[in-house]
Amino acid sequence: MMTGTIETTGNISAEKGGSIILQCHLSSTTAQVTQVNWEQQDQLLAICNADLGWHISPSFKDRVAPGPGLGLTLQSLTVNDTGEYFCIYHTYPDGTYTGRIFLEVLESSVAEHGARFQIP
């Protein structure tokens, strides 16, 4: 039985040109995390494998950085990055857990507290 739950950063509104961190955390289970996939729509952004480490998809190499932890940092945001992002936890013996985060990227004058979305 799958007892775990995924907690996420929550939905985010960010500035065009800025950076944000997407994070998920799996709790309430003793299952072993074997791999975490980060996806947007049907595109694979990155994989963090327990044995092999990180793999960033070639098309996102310039703008996606691994971490912190099992999270993902998106840089140089564009309006086209607006959309839903999925963290997919592959675990043993539970199976797959999925978290969802919606990111809205807005022109600089619109996003709330824009400076807070910059990664130091």
Partner: antibody, heavy 119, light 112 residues
Framework: EVQLQQSGPELVKPGASMKISCKAS????????MNWVKQSHGKNLEWIGL????????SYNQKFKGKATLTVDKSSSTAYMELLSLTSEDSAVYYC????????????WGQGTSVTVSS | DVVVTQTPLSLPVSFGDQVSISCRSS???????????LSWYLHKPGQSPQLLIY???NRFSGVPDRFSGSGSGTDFTLKISTIKPEDLGMYYC?????????FGGGTKLEIK
């Protein structure tokens, strides 16, 4: 003035599919997310999903995946929701709503489209 | 999904009364950047729902200042300071922090 004009009421047979339209005016259509909301029994509100007119991206409530399909026509500033394989459970009023930028709220609502599924 | 619970279900009032409606969520509505996406709506009979309050406490344009929102974390309140006839209807809160967005069950504001 921001307006969301929805198509008229529908009476459809069980098993059929149908499409509701939502024509936006008074603002830049591609600059705002469009949500769809179901109201059952004149009370409960449920978020069905959203579409990003700018890039066509979608996000669905898992409960409505396979039931609703969201699309847009940028040239006419119109959003569409197709409802598939209708049953009596789908009888409701459906609203399109504009997403309020940066606050994940819904600032403007269409007038609603009443859908009745009956043989 | 985040469960949003509204109380009371029904609120009988007299014109001129001050009332409060509570909205509680099953998990915190503050995202990792400290923003909380909680909004309030009024649905009057025969009309579409209308936005009253967004981001916990911001009044939407044209909304009278007798409406105010407050709260944090999992506990939120809508206050109406002096009830008028046009305030009658169903009130809903909506959390937009977690996917999917979820509405409260509604509070019916009706005359005593």
């Amino acid at each position: 003035e921001v307006q969301l004009q929805q198509s008229g009421p529908e009476l459809v047979k069980p098993g059929a599919s149908m499409k509701i339209s939502c024509k936006a005016s008074g603002y830049s259509f591609t600059g705002y997310i469009m949500n769809w909301v179901k109201q059952s029994h004149g009370k409960n509100l449920e978020w069905i999903g959203l579409i990003i007119p700018y890039n066509g991206g979608t996000s669905y409530n898992q409960k409505f995946k396979g039931k609703a399909t969201l699309t847009v026509d940028k040239s006419s500033s119109t959003a569409y929701m197709e409802l598939l394989s209708l049953t009596s459970e789908d009888s409701a009023v459906y609203y399109c709503t504009r997403g309020l930028q940066r606050f994940y709220a819904m600032d403007y609502w269409g007038q609603g489209t009443s859908v009745t599924v009956s043989s | 999904d985040v469960v949003v619970t509204q109380t009371p279900l029904s609120l009988p009032v007299s014109f001129g009364d001050q009332v409060s409606i509570s909205c509680r969520s099953s998990q915190s509505l503050a995202n990792s950047y400290g923003n909380t996406y909680l909004s309030w709506y009024l649905h009057k009979p025969g009309q579409s729902p209308q936005l009253l309050i967004y981001g916990i406490s911001n009044r939407f344009s044209g909304v009278p200042d007798r409406f105010s929102g407050s709260g944090s974390g999992t506990d939120f309140t809508l206050k109406i300071s002096t009830i008028k006839p046009e305030d009658l209807g169903m009130y809903y809160c909506l959390q937009g922090t977690h996917q999917p967005p979820t509405f409260g069950g509604g509070t019916k504001l009706e005359i005593k």
